[in-house]
Each structure stands twice: as structure tokens, then as C-alpha cells.
């Protein structure tokens, strides 16, 4: 080994050398915080620059760059270092337009916090584990909620679309006529009949048991979906994104009551479904491969 | 499809009575209202009555008392019936309803549908 490698090693493996990284990084992120950054912070930055370039050198000369197993480059955390070191020239030095673009590559630095704090590195380690062993999961998750998207494709397209809409138009007004005009949301609440703090008219079905318009008022499939036309079944993939929000149960109950409105009491057996199997069962199976992945990553 | 299909019209002394039908056929959800116009030679369409789903009814002020509309809606059928016929009310009357149904590949529509018409003439 040559002196300047033997140096380098010393170095790397001191326990100041990791601890002056560690105070870099959580300095750096304190500086990255701040809104509108005084002039000096400038010389501040190149500093911190010049720290992570002399860290990554240390490296380098103590390790190797990227021929042997042991190298600089074969270890994944020191691609993070890496990534941000030629950024942090790039941004400085390259004229490349939209800087502000790349300069959002310097929160990177935070994460280097990761490499350095050994606990985080397991967590981080166990993640990524958990990723791979959840690909199985992931294509099960997925073919359920395609399945049962196709379903409530089939069951509720365009059914979110039922509005109760006012008999006692003017004489020469028609429903084509009215929906070519109507603009504001005054024009709206003015011919659908609106709950009280409601922003969407009241749904309707056309079944027995769907939801029924009061008097003055008729069901008609007419307009957009409720929710400024997120909350449909009328093609896959919004279907898809229902399915991923009843699986997540986001606001599920809201869905639920739009759908039994408009469709019918009777597809309360749909959701129960849905529930049972996308948010009980898959979602612990999600958790089930998490933490498996965690204990592996900790033995 | 939805079609409207009046009937009933025809010639008719003033004074006398006529009772006009509009049906709609197609595979019908609801019919939200029904509504009889009159178009008479050179002259502009004109609403005459009208009926709602709630059996909710309005007329033109030059037919009231003398016209009056009703449906029944098992039949999706609505029906006007023309007392004290004058002269000026000979026209071609058209029925207009406002339709959700069922059309083809089972998707749900709701439009407004116009029947043909029927001839209603009053001379003496």
C-alpha cells in the first residue's frame, strides 16, 4: 500500500472522520432550509461541496474506484455520494438553462444522512428488500383490483352520472337547450336539486331500490361525475382508481354511498367483497412480506 | 330507440272536442315530462300544456279551462283533451317528453324526443 492509500484508510476508518460527515450533512440540511439564504451562504455551500468531494476522495483512494468487489462505486451508497458530488459541479460550473431543475438534486444530500447512521441504513436496507419480495404481492394486488375493477365497470358505468333534475322547466326550455347553457355553479343548483352544503346535485337510480329524487325533480344520466369528475366507473382506469381507494379505504364510505344511490342497495355485496379481500386481506399481506423483509434485514 | 307517436287528431267542428294521445315506446326508465306544442300554418311553434312525472301540470293561458292534460304512466302514454274548440287553435300538434332509457349496448340516455305530429283541424 502506498503511503497516500494507508493515510486514506486511516482516515476513513476514524470515528471523527464519520462524525465531521454526519455534522456536514445535518448542517447542510439546516442551510437548505432557509427561504431566502443571505449572499454568504454562497461560500457556505462550496464548503460543504469541498467536505463531500474530500469524503468521496478518501474513498476512492482508500477503496479503489470500480475495478475489485470492494471498490468505491460497487457499494450502492457511494453512487448517492456520487450523484450529488456531480451535481453540485454541474449546477456550479455547466451552464444547462433551467438550473432550478437541477438544483432540486441537492436534496439528495439529506439522504446521505442513511449511509452514515447505521440504523437508518438497516430500515433503508429493509425496505428495499421488502420491495423485492413484495413484486409477488404487488402482481396479486393488482390483478384483484383489475378483476374488480372490470366488475364495477360492468355493474356502475356511467350510473354516477344520475342526477335529479327539475321537471318545470320554462315552456320553451329543454334538457339539450339547459345543458348547452348552463356555465356557473348557480346554473346548475338552478335545474339539479342540490343537498344542503353539498357540492355535487343528489344522485339518483333508476332501480327499486337506488335513491329516489324528491317531488318536482326526475332522475336523469345527464353532465359530469361527482367530485369534479374523479368518482367514476365509466372507463378501467378510472374504475381501477376507485378500486385503489376502496383498498385504501381513502373516504371509501363516500364512494359506497354514491354507487348504492345511484345503482341500488343490492351492490352493498360488491363493497363488502372489496373490503374484506382488498383492504383486510391484501393490505396485510402487504404488511405480512414488510416486516418478514424487516426481521430478515435484522438477523 | 325512443319514439313518441301521437294520435287522435282530425277534423272537427268549433265547439266540439278531440282527446290527442302521444305514446312513447323504446325501453323506457322514466319519463320526466310530456309536453304538447302546436305549430299552425306560417307561425312559430307554440307550448300548449305540459306534465310532469309527479302529475304536476301547466298550460298556455289561451288554452286554459277549455284543455287538459293527463298521463299514464304505465303505458308511458300522456293524453290531451281539447273542449270548446276554436278555429284558431286548428294547428299540428307535437308531443315532447323528456326520456331516460335504455339504449343499445344497455348504456343508460336521457334526451328530448319529438313525435311527428297530428293534424287538428277546426272549421265549420
Known amino acids: 500500500f502506498s503511503p497516500l492509500r494507508r493515510i486514506s484508510i486511516k482516515i476513513l476508518v476514524h470515528s471523527l472522520f464519520s462524525m465531521l460527515i454526519m455534522c456536514t450533512i445535518l448542517t447542510n440540511c439546516i442551510f437548505m432550509t432557509m427561504n431566502n439564504p443571505p449572499d454568504w451562504t454562497k461560500n457556505v455551500e462550496y464548503t460543504f461541496t469541498g467536505i463531500y468531494t474530500f469524503e468521496s476522495l478518501v474513498k476512492i483512494l482508500a477503496r479503489g474506484f470500480c475495478v475489485g468487489e470492494f471498490t468505491f462505486l460497487r457499494d450502492p451508497w457511494n453512487w448517492l455520494d456520487f450523484v450529488v458530488i456531480v451535481f453540485a459541479y454541474l449546477t456550479e460550473f455547466v451552464n444547462l438553462g433551467n438550473v432550478s431543475a437541477l438544483r432540486t438534486f441537492r436534496v439528495l444530500r439529506a439522504l446521505k444522512t442513511i449511509s452514515v447512521i447505521p440504523g437508518l441504513k438497516t430500515i433503508v436496507g429493509a425496505l428495499i428488500q421488502s420491495v423485492k419480495k413484495l413484486s409477488d404481492v404487488m402482481i396479486l394486488t393488482v390483478f384483484c383490483l383489475s378483476v374488480f375493477a372490470l366488475i364495477g365497470l360492468q355493474l356502475f358505468m356511467g350510473n354516477l352520472k344520475h342526477k335529479c333534475f327539475r321537471n318545470s322547466l320554462e315552456n320553451n326550455e329543454t334538457l339539450e337547450s339547459i345543458m348547452n347553457t348552463l356555465e356557473s355553479e348557480e346554473d346548475f343548483r338552478k335545474y339539479f336539486y342540490y343537498l344542503e352544503g353539498s357540492k355535487d346535485a343528489l344522485l339518483c337510480g333508476f332501480s327499486t331500490d337506488s335513491g329516489q329524487c324528491p317531488e318536482g325533480y326526475t332522475c336523469v344520466k345527464i353532465g359530469r361525475n361527482p367530485d369534479y369528475g374523479y368518482t367514476s366507473f365509466d372507463t378501467f382506469s378510472w374504475a381501477f382508481l376507485a378500486l385503489f381507494r376502496l383498498m385504501t379505504q381513502d373516504y371509501w364510505e363516500n364512494l359506497y354511498q354514491q354507487t348504492l344511490r345511484a345503482a341500488g342497495k343490492t351492490y352493498m355485496i360488491f363493497f363488502v367483497v372489496v373490503i374484506f379481500l382488498g383492504s383486510f386481506y391484501l393490505i396485510n399481506l402487504i404488511l405480512a412480506v414488510v416486516a418478514m423483509a424487516y426481521e430478515e434485514q435484522n438477523q | 330507440e325512443v319514439q313518441l307517436v301521437e294520435s287522435g287528431g282530425g277534423v272537427v267542428q268549433p265547439g266540439g272536442s278531440l282527446r290527442l294521445s302521444c305514446a312513447a315506446s323504446?325501453?323506457?326508465?322514466?319519463?320526466?315530462?310530456m309536453r304538447w306544442y302546436r305549430q299552425a300554418p306560417g307561425k312559430q311553434r307554440e307550448f300548449v300544456a305540459r306534465i310532469t312525472d309527479d302529475s304536476a301540470t301547466g298550460y298556455a293561458d289561451s288554452v286554459k279551462g277549455r284543455f287538459t292534460i293527463s298521463r299514464d304512466a304505465a303505458k308511458n302514454t300522456v293524453y290531451l283533451q281539447m273542449n270548446s274548440l276554436r278555429p284558431e287553435d286548428t294547428a299540428l300538434y307535437y308531443c315532447e317528453a323528456l326520456v331516460t332509457a335504455s339504449v343499445r349496448g344497455g348504456s343508460i340516455h336521457s334526451g328530448t324526443y319529438w313525435g311527428q305530429g297530428t293534424l287538428v283541424t277546426v272549421s265549420s
Open positions: 323504446g325501453r323506457i326508465l322514466r319519463i320526466g315530462y
